[in-house]
Interface confidence: low
């Protein structure tokens, strides 16, 4: 009679993470008598996966009933596969012996490859805000995928970015891999509503890539432009001066009026108007009683935006252009929170 052969018909098996792997194995003879064991790997460091004779293997089930006398099918199923299960599995026939069974014949092995989906890409931007024209870096990370081949792309508002560097780790063989990419993006004044998207494509995703996003509103600071103007005279000796603060982002802004270099009033931007591009406009105004002044007045609108150094714009108010009334009240009425008399 021909000597027993152990046949593993599948050289390789590919399974998605979370699924069940079937590892096939048959023997060509019932003789010699003895159990089958399954191992991952070969040599002295091999790992026991299943022992027909004894032990508890909760993830492993046999395809056929190994207790039947004429059974020659020793295939197994391994449930809830993870990337850590990848490797070459050997079906090994043992001959009954005393005191221990003796290894008799091994199958050629079946390589189990595990396909694992990448985790959702996480995009993170710089810790500090940056202004338009500056280049900022964004990072994208995704983990736990297998096989190693993966494609990563960056987009800004649908336009593919080109200035990025990507690494897949580890370089050598591993049960699963991680990808890390850093992209450089040049900010523009219109980027408050912009998005940066990291897109990851992998064989496990079946053409439906994963995306991570970052809003540039969390990254950009658009500094304001200031314009100080003198409005028409509201009353004979009152002048309305406005400070237009335009196109700034984020909203955090504090404005200080100075009269000849002395602080007159400080206020925080509250009721702002939003522009289509996401930036804000705000206006502060000051009611100046010119009769309280003998000389020209230098009015300065000083703005501190988002904790940055203050910027300012000045306006020279010509007192001589406004005739003073003798005995007029130096305390002009204060008609609103944005109005202030200057003394």
């Amino acid at each position: 009679e021909e000597e027993l052969q152990v046949i593993q018909p599948d050289k390789s098996v590919l399974v998605a993470a979370g699924e069940t792997a079937t590892l096939r194995c048959t023997a060509t003879s019932l003789i010699p008598v003895g159990p089958i064991q399954w191992f991952r790997g070969a040599g002295p460091g091999r790992e026991l996966i299943y022992n027909q004779k004894e032990g508890h293997f909760p993830r492993v089930t046999t395809v056929s009933d190994l207790t039947k006398r004429n059974n020659m099918d020793f295939s197994i199923r391994i449930g809830n596969i993870t990337p850590a299960d990848a490797g070459t599995y050997y079906c090994v026939k043992f001959r009954k012996g005393s005191p221990d069974d003796v290894e008799f014949k091994s199958g050629a092995g079946t390589e189990l490859s595990v396909r694992a989906k990448p985790s959702a890409p996480v995009v993170s931007g710089p810790a500090a805000r940056a202004t338009p024209q500056h280049t900022v870096s964004f990072t994208c990370e995704s983990h736990g995928f297998s096989p190693r081949d993966i494609t990563l792309k960056w987009f800004k508002n649908g336009n593919e970015l080109s200035d990025f560097q990507t690494n897949v780790d580890p370089v050598g063989e591993s049960v699963s891999y991680s990808i890390h990419s850093t992209a450089k993006v040049v900010l523009t004044r219109e980027d408050v509503h912009s998005q940066v998207i990291c897109e990851v494509a992998h064989v496990t995703l079946q053409g439906d890539p994963l995306r991570g996003t970052a809003n540039l509103s969390e990254t950009i600071r658009v500094p304001p432009t200031l314009e100080v103007t003198q409005q028409p005279v509201r009353a004979e000796n009152q002048v309305n001066v406005t400070c237009q603060v335009r196109k700034f982002y984020p909203q955090r802004l504090q404005l200080t009026w100075l009269e000849n270099g002395n602080v007159s009033r400080t206020e925080t931007a509250s009721t702002v108007t939003e522009n289509k591009d996401g930036t804000y406009n705000w206006m502060s105004w000051l009611l100046v009683n010119v009769s309280a002044h003998r000389d020209d007045v230098k009015l300065t609108c000083q703005v501190e935006h988002d904790g940055q150094p203050a910027v300012s714009k000045s306006h020279d108010l010509k007192v001589s252009a406004h005739p003073k009334e003798q005995g007029s009240n130096t305390a002009a009425e204060n008609t609103g929170s944005n109005e202030r008399n200057i003394y």
């Epitope: 280049t135 336009n159 593919e160 970015l161 080109s162 200035d163 560097q165 990507t166 040049v186």
Partner: nanobody
Framework: QVQLVESGGGLVQPGGSLRLSCADS????????TGWFRQAPGREREGVAC????????RYTDSVRGRFTISRDNARRTVYLQMNSLRPEDTAVYYC???????????????????WGQGTQVTVSS
């Protein structure tokens, strides 16, 4: 202003090859995403191929994919377009362009590219 200069054009038979070069007289081409575009008589200018600043990303229009290869030598600050298996319909003036914003990679339109060379004529004819 970046000054791009193309070279390598000429007359070639169908099935032949040409290699176009694009260099910058100010030697700054390595800082920018760069594209090759072409314009045939009576037709709109179209993107042919483009390459990122680092050279790690390339893109081709469908009609040239597999026949043309874009590459760059940043040490020489030169971008190349290797054109194989040329066809009569490849006849056009070929332009090199740089995207000075550096971070777009787009060949679908040439609006992102804001610095252009004068062009080099490529004629494919028997």
């Amino acid at each position: 202003q970046v000054q791009l200069v193309e070279s390598g054009g000429g007359l070639v038979q169908p099935g032949g090859s040409l290699r176009l070069s694009c260099a910058d007289s100010e030697f700054r081409l390595d800082e920018y995403a760069t594209g090759w575009f072409r314009q045939a008589p009576g037709r709109e200018r179209e993107g042919v191929a483009c390459i990122s600043r680092s050279g790690s990303n390339t893109r081709y229009t469908d009609s040239v994919r597999g026949r043309f290869t874009i590459s760059r030598d940043n040490a020489r600050r030169t971008v190349y377009l290797q054109m194989n298996s040329l066809r009569p319909e490849d006849t056009a003036v070929y332009y090199c362009a740089a995207d000075l914003t550096s971070h777009y990679l787009s060949c679908s339109s040439y609006t992102d590219y804001n610095s252009w060379g004068q062009g080099t004529q490529v004629t494919v004819s028997s």
